[in-house]
Amino acid sequence: LDSPDRPWSPLTFSPAQLTVQEGENATFTCSLADIPDSFVLNWYRLSPRNQTDKLAAFQEDRIEPGRDRRFRVTRLPNGRDFHMSIVAARLNDSGIYLCGAIYLPPNTQINESPRAELSVTERTLEPPTQSPSPPPRLSGQLQGLVIGVTSVLVGVLLLLLLTWVLAAVFPRATRGACVCGSEDEPLKEGPDAAPVFTLDYGELDFQWREKTPEPPAPCAPEQTEYATIVFPGRPASPGRRASASSLQGAQPPSPEDGPGLWPL
């Protein structure tokens, strides 16, 4: 073992004990005394039966990830230190870890580092203070309460926004105004649109369209097409009635009701 042609002295694997909260990264450092020309560096976890389970490896400037991509090996700039990290550590990652180096031919040699212990602790909501922290169950209830209240507030705000949008859109629609995208951008549905509760009324079957086509209101061309539903304030005529079968969900107010907003 102490032969003068030994490629490098035994590996170090630091720290001897590492304690992390669950969800944080757990990083060990495997260090070589010097940098051999050709080597393989393996990262192991010791199984309950004292077997070494390989987690990841580094060979010839190439990282070989294991089955679990949370286990990562990174070579540091100094060339002789390797970070062996568990990304977002879990409670069951607690255990004994080590690294092993295989010096490739002509001077084949295998070195194993000392073992190190990882302890993953349950996450606490805030760092420990002088006063005792409340039990986890209570903090969970508080968290649920906060989420609930926030959800209600967001819902109320969205309803107010929807009411405002509808109030802004439909009076203009009754005067024959064109609904264009510039002012009414919140109505646009798309991946970057704000979440707005929409009611799907299906396809309106206007049978009169073939006989008396109406010229559309002048409108600047744009990418997205919008349909404007106009409920004129004149008596109902059979030719302008939407077929009931084509309506889904809530029914719009009948023309007899006169102009008005959709019920919320």
């Epitope: 170090t12 590492l18 944080e24 990083t27 450092t29």
Partner: nanobody, 123 residues
Framework: QVQLQQSGGGLVQAGGSLRVSCAAS????????MGWFRQAPGKEREFVAA????????YYADSAKGRFTISRDNAKNTVYLQMNSLKPEDTAVYYC????????????????WGQGTQVTVKP
């Protein structure tokens, strides 16, 4: 310029306890964290323990395992090393270290040091 001001230490009987502390100033707390090294007479400076600034991660050398506890108080920008069950071989000058990126275990890779605190454990 980072400045690390150490306090604590002293003389204690074997089996006793001591606490050393290190207050950091002149820095923003974007660095990784802080740690402790020690240097016994005639020996090289060696890693003892370290802690991340979140406090969620602690690192211990084999010599400190189970006996020493590192902690921090971010409000005071201070790191503590609580040493229990002290042995005569723990006698050394203890140095506070500042980590700017990640934990390292070689003293030559540390950027800033405290002035050192003598800890002497009598048999």
């Amino acid at each position: 310029q980072v400045q690390l001001q150490q306090s604590g230490g002293g003389l204690v009987q074997a089996g006793g306890s001591l606490r050393v502390s290190c207050a950091a100033s002149g820095r923003t707390f974007s660095s990784y964290g802080m740690g402790w090294f020690r240097q016994a007479p005639g020996k090289e400076r060696e890693f003892v323990a370290a802690i991340s600034w979140s406090g969620g991660t602690q690192y211990y050398a084999d010599s400190a395992k189970g006996r020493f506890t590192i902690s921090r108080d971010n409000a005071k920008n201070t790191v503590y090393l609580q040493m229990n069950s002290l042995k005569p071989e723990d006698t050394a000058v203890y140095y506070c270290a500042d980590y700017t990126d990640y934990v390292v275990y070689r003293p030559q890779e540390i950027g800033y040091w405290g002035q050192g605190t003598q800890v002497t454990v009598k048999p």
